[in-house]
Structure formats: C-alpha cells, structure tokens
C-alpha cells in the first residue's frame, strides 16, 4: 500500500489499466482512508476528467473500475481526484487528493511509413554501398514497453540490386545497375516491430528508384558508309547530306559532335542539328567536277561532355566513310585570262593581227568555241580568237580601244562568257613637229641688229616615251633672207634676231623666213615652217604692241613637209 505523505489518511496502490480491454468493467484498484473501519459509514467520490464515464468508484468500498475500452495511443494518463465523506456528518474525512491512472501499452500498432511516397535518384553503375535513401517507419506503441516500438527493416523486393540496413532503414546499392537496360526500380521495404519476434506487427512501403544517366556509352554511327552527291555549281554552305550516330545515353550525355577526318582539301565541314543530333555535311569550298569528280572523307563522332573517369569508354571514336560524288554541270566557257591587253602600232594596214584571245569549255566534252567582238568597228575576230584590224589605226585619233570578246559554246550557245580586251595603239613617229601656235611677228623699222624679234616653240602630235626634243634651223633654201637669223636655244625654243639695223616699211613690208624643225623620233621627222615677219612703224618707242591694230595685211604662215 502507498500512503500519501500530505494526506496521511489516504491509502492506494499504483493504478494501471491495460489498453484495449474488452470487458464491461475492469477492476483497477482501491482507494481507501485508514480511518475507514469497514462499517459503511464513509462514502467515496471520484472527480475529474473521465470520472463517471471512463472510470467509476464503488462509493462504499473505494474500488475503482474502468468501464470503457482504453487506447493508450489516444491517452496514456488520467489524473483524477478522490474524496471521502463521513455519511453521518457530510464532512470530508480526508482532504481531497489527486491520483494517477496509467494506461499500460499492448503491441496493437504496426509500424507506419509517414513520409511516403519515397522517390530516389541514383546514378547508374554506382558502386556497391552507395547511399540511395533512408526510409523511416513510426510505431505509435510505447517505446518503453518491451519491444513494442522497436523496428527492424528488411527488403521484401529489390534484390539483388538493393539492400536495407535493418536498424536504420538506409537503402544502399548492392549491385551495379545499367540504366540502358532498366531505368526504374520498385523496391518494397518491410518494417517489423518487436524486433521481428513472434507477435510482431509489420508495415510496408514502396520506394521508386530512378537511375540517372552517366556517360558510359560512346556514340556510334548507324551507317558505316554514306553516299552523297553535290552539283559543282553548289554555293559554299550548301547542305550535302545528313549523317547520324546513335548513343544509348540520354540528355547531355548523348550530345555529340561530328568532325571530318582525312580531308586535306578542307572542302567539307559538319555542323550539328541540335534537335535531332544529326550531322549535316556542308560545303566549305567550291567543288569542280573537272578537277575532282568525287571525294572520300571520313567522319568521326564523339560526345561533347565526357568525365575523366569515363574516358576509357570513349576511346576509339566511331567513324564512318562518306563518298561525295560531284555532279557535272554544263559550265560556261572560261577565258585563259580575266582580261587581255594587246598592242598594235598605228598605221598598220587593214587585216593586221592584233593578238589572240582563247576560251575553253571547262566541261569534259570540250565544246569548240565561237567568238564575237563588240566595242569598235575597227576590229574583227575569227573563230580561233584572233583579233584583226578592219581599218588603219591612228594613235592620234584613238590611243586605246576597249573591246569585249564573247565566247559561246558551239554545242550550247546558251553558255556564254565575256572578257575585256584592251588594245593599245602605240605610236610610230609619223608626225613632224610644227609651230606650237600661229605667230604674228613684227619688226620695227628702227630695229637694231641683234634685237629679238620672236621666240618660237614647237609641238609634235606623236607620243613620246622620252620627252620630245626639237631642233630648229634656218632653211638653207632661204638664201635671199639674210635680214634675220635663228638661234636654237636647245630647250625646245628658238630665238629670231634682227640681222641688220633698220627696215623700210614701204620698200619691204613683209619678210618670209623658212624655219626647219626636226624631232628626236626614230626616224627623225623634219618640217618646214614659214614665219611671216611684218615691218611696222613703231615710232620711237620701238614697241611692236601697237602694230597689230594698224590694219596691216596679215599674211598667214604656212607649213610644208
């Protein structure tokens, strides 16, 4: 018996009631006062939560009964108050006292997994022992009563790839898994209480384990040989065809890049279609059927992202052979040169050959050519591309001719090409020098001997590679004219000087001086030029500037050759 220290008169046992008892009333124990002599003079009362509904007391004896099935998991402790009253006086015999009824546990709850659903992701080919996920079961029973809430885990489904630690619920890999064979595993874990002993209750959960991809597969071409054709007229960047490699991996691990091997000519390239992972073979340089009618190239494929530890799976990259056939196109003629510069001396007779232009058919059949010439009626062209003159050419009329020669294929007049032909007419020395201007020359009646009468210069319509050089001389034929003399300045000018003092306007109003001018051409040409010198009354000023206004008869100079 237990006697309450504060309430000296109360006596009771520790009260326990097992949960889940099915009887209508279950005796728990007895409350009594040590003043109670058993003559039914005391009345016992029960107060507090559960009093009268869950628990009742025998008012005479103090015996307490549970009248309802109890569930420890719902409520494990009841705190009640007890009173004992003297029936005769109606007074409390003892002070009111608090006491406790404990509900004792039975193993009536199975372990439950509260965090469902369980889902885990783990890389494929992970080594044994790799942590996957931890599952936890909860048991509502009393952990302090026996092994009611002591849980052990075991694998119901998932061998041989997974294992579970019995006491922690940690799931680990027990065998490497290949995502390419199976990418999802369904593991069933059982949790048992009572440490799995007889009478244990159990619960299960399903764990969905997904394998994430690792880059353990290299891409491999599904075709070992591709044949493509391309027209020789295809522009740079043309797509020639598609090649395809396949990789069992997924996502980033299946991303691949293609490259061209064995293509010294660097004519082709491969770009990737990111949507389909196909390689598109494109033209990087123009092709020419006549130069090379087919190309054999090798393409290689590899993954874009390879971890160092997986590199061994990617050695010996897959290759495929690509044969590109170039299709012949009827191409226009091709001139030997982009343009021609021809030369011909002026003055050559009609029919003189200027030069030859040549165009060829780049195609295999080598069609003969027809030529047409435009740009000047001074030239013609024959069927083998020889350009001839149709007139005598004069460089002084035109020094350059800009011609266009058109070549067409005899077999296909639609195929046309043109080239510019520049004809330079080069100079022959066919022009003698002459006075550079018309000279109105006057000499004053009162001129002194040695006085400058005129400075003359010459021009030559010929082209000179070196500078023109002119030589001036008084014609020896001009014997009767000693009144003037000529001095060559040797700078392409000459000076006419008076050779006497005084002239008579009335007696000799005009003098004609015959002057020879020679050039430095090969052969040298000489012209005879007449300088008309008029005598003028200049007055004392000896200034000839007024002479031109005196209505003198001007006699033009003339030239003979």
């Amino acid at each position: 018996d237990y006697k309450d220290d504060d309430d000296k008169g109360w006596v009771w046992n520790q009260f326990f009631v097992p949960e889940e008892m099915n009887t209508t009333s279950h005796h728990i124990g007895q409350l009594r006062s040590d003043l109670d002599n058993g003559n039914n003079s005391f009345q016992y009362k029960l107060l507090g939560a559960g009093a009268g509904s869950t628990f009742i007391i025998d008012e005479r004896t103090g015996d307490i009964y549970a009248i309802q099935k109890l569930d420890r998991e719902e409520r494990s402790l009841y705190i009640l108050r007890a009173q004992v009253i003297d029936i005769a006086t109606g007074r409390a015999v003892e002070p009111e006292s608090e006491f406790v009824i404990k509900v004792s546990d039975i193993n009536d709850n199975e372990p439950r997994f509260l965090d469902e659903p369980y889902e885990a992701i783990v890389p494929e080919m992970s080594p044994e022992g790799t942590f996957v996920i931890k599952v936890t079961a909860n048991d509502a029973d009393d952990p302090s009563t026996g092994y009611h809430a002591r849980i052990l885990y075991n694998l119901e489904r998932g061998q041989p790839y997974f294992s579970v630690e019995p006491t922690t619920g940690v799931i680990r890999i027990s065998s490497k898994m290949d995502r390419e064979l199976q990418d999802t595993y369904c593991v069933i874990i059982q949790a048992k209480d009572m440490l799995g002993q007889p009478g244990a209750l159990s619960g299960t959960t399903t764990v969905s384990i997904k394998l994430s991809d690792i880059n353990d597969n290299k891409p491999i071409f599904k075709e070992s040989f591709y044949r493509f054709t391309i027209s020789e007229s295809a522009p740079i960047g043309t797509s020639i065809g598609k090649i395809m490699a396949y990789d069992d991996d997924i996502g980033e691990n299946a991303e691949m890049e293609y490259s061209i091997e064995d293509d010294d000519s660097k004519i082709f390239d491969i770009i990737i279609d990111n949507d389909t992972q196909e390689g598109i073979v494109i033209l990087k340089k123009k092709v020419d059927f006549e130069q090379q009618s087919y190309y054999g190239i090798r393409a290689k494929v590899k993954n874009c992202h390879v971890d160092e530890e997986l590199a061994p799976a990617h050695v010996n990259a897959s290759t495929t052979y690509i044969k590109v056939q170039v299709e012949d196109e009827d191409e226009p003629p091709v001139f030997l040169l982009p343009y021609y510069i021809l030369e011909i001396p002026e003055g050559k007779p009609y029919g003189t050959i200027v030069g030859t232009v040549s165009a060829t058919d780049p195609d295999r059949r080598q069609s003969p050519m027809r030529y047409y010439l435009t740009g000047s009626k001074m030239f013609d062209i024959n069927d083998n591309g020889t350009i001839i003159t149709t007139n005598m050419l004069d460089r002084e009329v035109s020094a350059w001719y800009n011609l266009t020669v058109t070549a067409t294929e005899t077999y296909n007049v639609q195929q046309i090409s043109s080239a510019h032909v520049y004809v330079q007419v080069f100079n022959i020395n066919d022009n003698a020098p002459e006075f550079s201007q018309f000279y109105e020359t006057y000499v004053c009646e009162n001129a002194e001997s040695g006085e400058i009468v005129q400075i003359i210069s010459a021009i030559d319509r010929d082209e000179s590679i070196e500078d023109h050089h002119f030589y001036f001389n008084h014609s020896l034929e001009d014997t009767n004219n000693s009144s003037f003399m000529l001095t060559d300045n040797q700078d392409n000018t000459a000076v006419i000087l008076s050779n006497r003092t005084g002239f008579n306007l009335k007696e000799e109003p005009v003098f004609y001086m015959i002057i020879l001018i020679a050039d430095n051409g090969i052969p040298s040409l000489t012209s005879t030029n007449t300088l008309t010198i008029q005598v003028c009354d200049c007055g004392d000023s000896r200034n000839t500037e007024t002479c031109a206004n005196k209505g003198l008869l001007f006699i033009m100079g003339f030239r003979t050759e």
């Epitope: 041989p160 065998s175 290949d178 064979l181 396949y246």
Partner: antibody, heavy 120, light 111 residues
C-alpha cells in the same frame, strides 16, 4: 581468343527449372553485354534477354518476363540463364552470345549451344 | 511469327548471284543496323555481315549487305556449294527494346 563455353545438355520435366551456364574467356568480361538466344528444333532464332556483367543489370524479352532470370558471377566470368515453369515448347538449343558495347550492336561470338529437352 | 520477314528458301547454282531479302519496320530496320548470321546444321550461328554492310575478317567479299528504308538484303555472288546454309537477319527494335530476328532463309546450291 574469345570463347564462350556453355554447360551440357539437360533433360527436364514440365514445371521444373533449368539453369544453363556460359563461361567467357579471352576478353574483359565486364565490358560486353551477354545475350541469350534460343532455337527450337527446326525453327528460327529467338532473343530471350540480355545481362550486363558489370553489375548484373538485365532486360528480358516480354515473352519470358517472370520466367527467366539471368545472373552472373564475375569471379568465374560466368553468366547463368535460369528458365522456370518449363513446358514442352521450351525444348530448344539455348545459346549465349557476346554483344557489343551498346545494346544494338551485333553478336560477334556465340557459345556452342545447350540442348534443353522438356519431356514428361 | 517473326518480326522480320525473310523468304523461307532460296536456290541457286554454282557461280550464280542470289539475294535474300529481309523486311522490317521503322522501329527496327528503319532505325538500326541490320546484321546477317549464317548457321550450318548443328552449329551455332556466325556473324556474316554486321552494321548493314561490314564483313568480319575471314568472310569473303562475295558476301555483301545493303539496307534501304525498312528493308535489307544479303547478296551472295559466285555461289559455291559451301554457301548452302541457313541465313538469318537481325536488328535491334527500339519499341520492343530487344532484338528481333528474321524467320531464316534456307539456301540450297543446286548441282
């Protein structure tokens, strides 16, 4: 040189199980898939499934799902194929064959075959 | 019923050229390599052509493979008596996630 050597012929009763072994040599055992193919008398070839010896992952043809189990023992470089609930139509020659490094690459080496006879 | 269709038999005379066809679908031949196996009676099959048109070393160049769309064919030129055998085509099937075979073609060399 690469060799796949299979276990000897078996005679089984309907409902029983048979376990055929295939011992590999001459190459790295864990680097290539192993496939199982069977051939009933006078019939064509029929693919049963595949195992990845590195880890033991498997994939089975729908027809054999639930009846076939493929396992491997890396210590002896041996692959096993067990077929349960045998019926008379399972009488066939069972071949193991080495696949490529990817599922869809050809079988380059074959075992000599194991004749399994199912008869009551 | 095989997933790949082959003629059950083919015949030819020595020196002749014979072709064996193999028809499939987009999920097998259409998207994957075709392989050809030769099987002599009582022996295991041997690979004859792999990845559509490749010959393993030791296989004479009289044997050639080709593929177009969802069909493939095996051609044997300069037929010889030792070519008499069963020939099987095979391909991985992406939708079945497994290998499929043709029913096999028995080649008879006459004379």
């Amino acid at each position: 040189q690469v060799q796949l050597v299979q276990s000897g012929a078996e005679v089984k009763k309907p409902g029983a199980s048979v376990k055929v072994s295939c011992k590999a040599s001459g190459y790295t055992f864990t680097s290539y898939y192993i496939h199982w193919v069977r051939q009933a008398p006078g019939q064509g070839l029929e693919w049963m499934g595949i195992i990845n010896p590195s880890g033991g992952s498997t994939r089975y043809a729908q027809k054999f799902q639930g009846r076939v189990t493929m396992t491997r023992d890396t210590s002896t470089s041996t692959v096993f194929m067990e077929l349960s609930s045998l019926r008379s139509e399972d009488t066939a020659v069972y071949y193991c064959a080495r696949g490529g490094i990817q599922l869809w690459l050809h079988f380059d080496y074959w075992g000599q075959g194991t004749l399994v006879t199912v008869s009551s | 019923q095989s997933a790949l269709t082959q003629p059950p038999s083919a015949t030819g005379t020595p020196g002749q050229r014979v072709t064996i066809s193999c028809s499939g679908s987009s999920s097998n031949i259409g998207r994957n390599f075709v392989n050809w196996y030769k099987q002599l009676p009582g022996t295991a099959p041997k690979v004859l052509i792999y990845t559509n048109n490749q010959r393993p070393s030791g296989v004479p160049d009289r044997f050639s493979g080709s593929k177009s769309g969802t069909s493939a064919s095996l051609a044997i030129s300069g037929l010889q008596s030792e070519d008499e055998s069963d020939y099987y085509c095979a391909a991985w099937d992406d939708s079945l996630n497994g290998w499929v075979f043709g029913g096999g073609t028995k080649l008879t060399v006459l004379g």
